[in-house]
């Protein structure tokens, strides 16, 4: 049996070498001479010759300093043979443990660690974590037990201890209030990692902490008073530019200005933000009226796109806006005037007066009236008074100029300001009907076939309006009833049916037809009838001599 005590060897041993470790023995040495040898890593395999054994005594020796961080344990096999070379023992595994010395200092995983924290962060806010490693034994010793400390902080303002580091974890957190990006945007910490829980070997690294922006500074007007002027009636006109400064990070929501007009209930003004320089551009949202108000004193507040992070006073500015008077066109009241008038209204008589009001109440101005559009040339106007009268007969049935019984004329009013301004009014003449149109037949030219003629429907048309229209009365005159008959086609008597009484010769005929409306206005119309050489429904006939009173006239 083997006698091998546990074997450990400290790393980094000083000489002289070789140095005895343990003496190994086999019980078989009582029976005769035993010779010892070793094999394995560190003996006969790389690194070869680190361990040797005295062949006759069994003393195991180390020949050079060991490095635990390179090889922490060596596995060897001991062999015992008799003088004739025969094995007297089975090979035995020998474990050599290299015990640790604190020969490695901690190493930070980075030379520079970068972190960030919001300005105004409260104590206890985590910022970042630094990490160091140590190659020494962290299981059986504290040679790799790292403790972290902060050695320095730059700047040391507003306090020299703005941050703390957890000695065990390396987590850096805020420990003092007062982080302010606008004053101190970055901090540089020199951090130390020391083994043996802070009492051993040490190394340093840098932690750079960026203080990020929050909206802790308000935009401030500079100056706080402004003057501007704007012509009346013009929308989207720039009045003035408002200037603000904001200490927060440029081109961020905490810097970008939002302008609010505090006393603009009518929504007459608007302030937009220039995205480049944060200026407020004050413009008119709608046209202003000099005659209503000549000056506005606006109070404008400025905030940011995002809310303030802390309680801040909102900056305000006062803007005095002078409205400039502009010569405005006269305004017809109403802008569209409706007047009812009979179509037989007497020529030269006054229909109505249509006048305009002068908006420029602060100017003494004279208004002159003219007719701008009068397509039928029916009207004339008094240039001073705006009185409108007829210069020709009106006609409701003039369908070229009258639509839906309405005649439209445009009137203009011109002041004597500088420059001259002109306003327009619309005059609608609603023409009431007079029974000035007798009924007429439609069509007036009719075709029949000689054989088996088909009766023809004739519509009765009256340009007037009820009650000056249907029911109509129809009557054949001048002997036409000898050859022709008529009868009403519908209860309103708005059409009749014409047909011959007997077979007629091919040729042209004239029929006198008297038509009378509901108010007894009548008119005799001559119908031109052609009888064709055909049967049933007629086509178009050759032209023949007309026949008076429905009788054929020989050629």
């Amino acid at each position: 049996d083997w006698v091998i005590p546990p074997i450990s060897c400290p790393e980094n041993e000083k000489g002289p070498f070789p140095k005895n470790l343990v003496q190994i023995k086999s019980n078989k040495d009582k029976e005769g001479k035993v010779f010892y040898s070793i094999t394995g890593q560190g003996a006969d395999t790389p690194p070869v010759g680190v361990f040797i054994i005295e062949r006759e005594t069994g003393w195991l020796k180390v020949t050079e300093p060991l490095d635990r961080e390179r090889i922490a344990t060596y596995t060897l096999f001991s062999h015992a043979v008799s003088s004739n070379g025969n094995a007297v023992e089975d090979p035995m595994e020998i474990l050599i443990t290299v015990t640790d010395q604190n020969d490695n200092k901690p190493e930070f995983t980075q030379e520079v660690f970068k972190g960030s924290v919001m300005e105004g962060a409260l104590p206890g806010t985590s910022v970042m974590e630094v990490t160091a490693t140590d190659a020494d034994d962290d299981v059986n010793t504290y040679n790799a037990a790292i403790a972290y400390t902060i050695l320095s902080q730059d700047p040391e303002l507003p306090d020299k201890n703005m941050f703390t580091i957890n000695r065990n974890t390396g987590v850096i957190s805020v420990v003092t209030t007062g982080l302010d990006r606008e004053s101190f945007p970055t901090y540089t910490l020199v951090v130390q990692a020391a083994d043996l829980q802070g009492e051993g070997l040490s190394t340093t690294a840098t932690a750079v902490i960026t203080v990020t922006d929050t909206n802790d500074n308000p935009p401030i007007f500079n100056p706080t008073t402004y003057k501007g002027q704007v012509p009346e009636n013009e929308a989207n006109v720039v009045i003035t530019t408002l200037k603000v400064t904001d200490a927060d990070a440029p081109n961020t929501p905490a810097w970008e200005a939002v302008y609010t007009i505090l006393n603009d209930d009518g929504g007459q003004f608007v302030v937009t933000t220039n995205p480049v320089n944060n200026d407020g551009i004050l413009k008119t949202a709608k046209g202003l009226d000099f005659e209503a108000k000549q000056q506005y004193i606006l109070h404008v507040a400025v905030t940011n796109v995002v809310p303030f992070e802390v309680s801040l006073t909102t900056s305000t500015a006062t803007v005095t806006v002078d409205v400039l008077d502009v010569n405005e066109a006269p305004i017809f009241v109403p802008p569209e005037k409706r007047v009812e008038v009979s179509e037989d209204f007497g020529v030269g008589q006054e229909i109505t007066s249509y006048t305009a009001q002068e908006p420029d109440t602060f100017m003494e101005q004279k208004i002159t009236y003219r007719i701008w559009r009068d397509t039928a040339n029916w009207l004339e106007i008094n240039p001073d008074t705006g009185a409108i009268s007829t210069r020709a007969e009106l006609d409701r049935e003039d369908f070229e100029h009258v639509k839906n019984s309405t005649y439209t004329a445009l009137i203009i009013a011109t002041d004597n300001g500088s420059p001259v301004a002109t306003g327009t009014g619309t005059l609608l003449l609603i023409l009431s009907d007079v029974n000035d149109n007798a009924p007429i037949p439609e069509p007036r030219t009719i075709f029949f076939c000689e054989r088996n003629p088909k009766p023809q429907v004739i519509n009765i048309i009256d340009a007037d309006l009820p009650p000056n229209t249907s029911p109509f009365t129809a009557e054949l005159t001048h002997g036409a009833s000898a050859n022709w008959t008529i009868q009403y086609n519908d209860p309103t008597q708005e059409s009749i049916i014409l047909k011959p009484k007997m077979a007629l010769e091919v040729g042209d005929y004239k029929i006198n037809l008297k038509l009378m409306d509901n108010q007894n206005k009548d008119q005799v119309t001559t119908l031109e009838v052609s009888v064709c050489d055909c049967e049933g429904a007629a086509g178009v006939c050759r032209k023949a001599q007309p026949v008076e009173a429905g009788l054929q006239i020989p050629a």
């Epitope: 490693t133 962290d138 957890n166 000695r167 957190s173």
Partner: antibody, heavy 120, light 112 residues
Framework: DVQLVESGGGLVQPGGSRKLSCAAS????????MHWVRQAPETGLEWVAY????????YYAATVKGRFTISRDNARNTLFLQMTSLRSEDTAMYYC?????????????WGQGTSVTVSS | DVLMTQTPLSLPVSLGDQASISCRSS???????????LEWYLRKPGQSPRLLIY???NRFSGVPDRFSGSGSGTDFTLKISRVEAEDLGVYYC?????????FGGGTKLEIK
């Protein structure tokens, strides 16, 4: 609200093994060092083990070194204690505790504990 | 390892009395960073322990000002100026300066 909930306790035979878990919520688990502390019946509090945020440094009490292993899973917000070769003197209420961010003191929040009994 | 010894084991008091608990470490517990990580914890029956004092003399948030801590090097004291019923329980000192970290054996504060 910070919460630490231990589980995995129970009756174990001497020489046996057990794995305790501690589910953390209400804080950024990965930024905090964590401890296991125990209290045996009729005796005082005993600190058992500690682990840093990234498991880079681990400390054990001499009484458990080589038998207990502390570990953590930051993705699952969970702390573990693997106990092997258990002895009757390991019978105790086991608490999971949180080290504060600053490390100014050892433990600011404690769980309600999980009971481990080692007996045949 | 640092051994923490607490005295007395039991401290009978009347409500309103002052109480004083001593804790002695087997070696200095001043950390290499200059801080002394000596803490006091209270465990009430049926509850998890809670922190009272850290770094020798700093009261944890929410701890009444009748609790105070003092000491340096190896000798530390916890004082309760006027004991109230809610203060009863077992008090432990703890050192977090040198791993492995250690608790004291505990002092039971009870009514006479």
């Amino acid at each position: 609200d910070v919460q630490l909930v231990e589980s995995g306790g129970g009756l174990v035979q001497p020489g046996g093994s057990r794995k305790l878990s501690c589910a953390a919520s209400g804080f950024t688990f990965s930024s905090y060092g964590m401890h296991w502390v125990r209290q045996a019946p009729e005796t005082g509090l005993e600190w058992v083990a500690y682990i840093t945020t990234r498991s880079s440094t681990i400390y054990y009490a001499a009484t458990v070194k080589g038998r207990f292993t502390i570990s953590r899973d930051n993705a699952r917000n969970t702390l573990f204690l693997q106990m092997t070769s258990l002895r009757s003197e390991d019978t105790a209420m086991y608490y999971c505790t949180r080290e504060p961010l600053t490390g100014y003191y050892a433990m600011d929040y404690w769980g309600q504990g999980t009971s481990v009994t080692v007996s045949s | 390892d640092v051994l923490m010894t607490q005295t007395p084991l039991s401290l009978p008091v009347s409500l309103g009395d002052q109480a004083s608990i001593s804790c002695r470490s087997s070696q200095s517990i001043v950390h290499s960073d200059g801080n002394t990580y000596l803490e006091w914890y209270l465990r009430k029956p049926g509850q998890s322990p809670r922190l009272l004092i850290y770094k020798v003399s700093n009261r944890f948030s929410g701890v009444p000002d009748r609790f105070s801590g003092s000491g340096s090097g190896t000798d530390f004291t916890l004082k309760i100026s006027r004991v109230e019923a809610e203060d009863l329980g077992v008090y432990y000192c703890f050192q977090g300066s040198h791993a492995p970290w250690t608790f004291g054996g505990g002092t039971k504060l009870e009514i006479k």
